[in-house]
Amino acid sequence: CKAMHVAQPAVVLASSRGIASFVCEYASPGKATEVRVTVLRQADSQVTEVCAATYMMGNELTFLDDSICTGTSSGNQVNLTIQGLRAMDTGLYICKVELMYPPPYYLGIGNGTQIYVIDPEPCPDSDF
């Protein structure tokens, strides 16, 4: 297993609809044709897997059917979107990238993106 650098933004603010997007960029040392991307959430010293995807270079990401994530790839960049977030989901979201094929296997883990989620205030009753 060889190490690889992964870059991601430090902070992202989710939209009022609970959607957060960020770019995960990896420094590919070779010409990988198969990549796995995993998003991990770290909160209160606990790490959980949020979603994972694989793709063959030049094609779209494939997530599991029930995934809350979507994404696209372009070169060595993966654009990730996480949906359905609420205030309790605020935390550090870490991007993990694995170059699966061809060998050698490379693994890179980003420093994480702190995603802040603010639940929208309910709309006040209108007199109209």
């Epitope: 198969e34 994972a52 694989t54 063959m56 094609n59 779209e60 494939t62 599991l64 059917d65 094929y101």
Partner: nanobody, 115 residues
């Protein structure tokens, strides 16, 4: 475990056509990508084309306009239509299954392009 069975390889003259098929069976995930790789003697295995469950495709520059990948999700089968074959297309063609949970290779089918 997923089993991949390729067929359709053979000997063809330059300029000719072949259609490769790959049937996936076993514990198949709901969403996955299928691809075709090829490996000529003494060379590294290279990605020729890939297709996702939703039908999104990608073809290597060297085969664009000549090869077309397609799939029949109901039959868990992926096809590679190869037209205007050249001697440099000769190789063992491998089917590839890639999902979030697993990845598998087929045993390969030989394509020979010679007059």
């Amino acid at each position: 475990q997923v089993k991949l069975e390729e067929s359709g390889g053979g000997l063809v003259q330059p300029g000719g056509s072949l259609r490769l098929s790959c049937v996936a069976s076993g514990s198949i995930d709901s969403t996955y990508t299928m691809g075709w790789y090829r490996q000529a003697p003494g060379k590294q295995r290279e990605l020729v084309a890939s297709i996702t469950s939703s039908g999104s495709t990608n073809h290597a520059d060297s085969v664009k306009g000549r090869f077309t990948i397609s799939r029949d999700n109901a039959k868990n089968t992926v096809y590679l239509q190869m037209n205007t074959l050249k001697p440099e297309d000769a190789a063992v063609y491998y089917c590839r299954y890639l999902s979030v949970l697993s990845a598998y290779w087929g045993q390969g089918t030989q394509v020979t392009v010679s007059s």
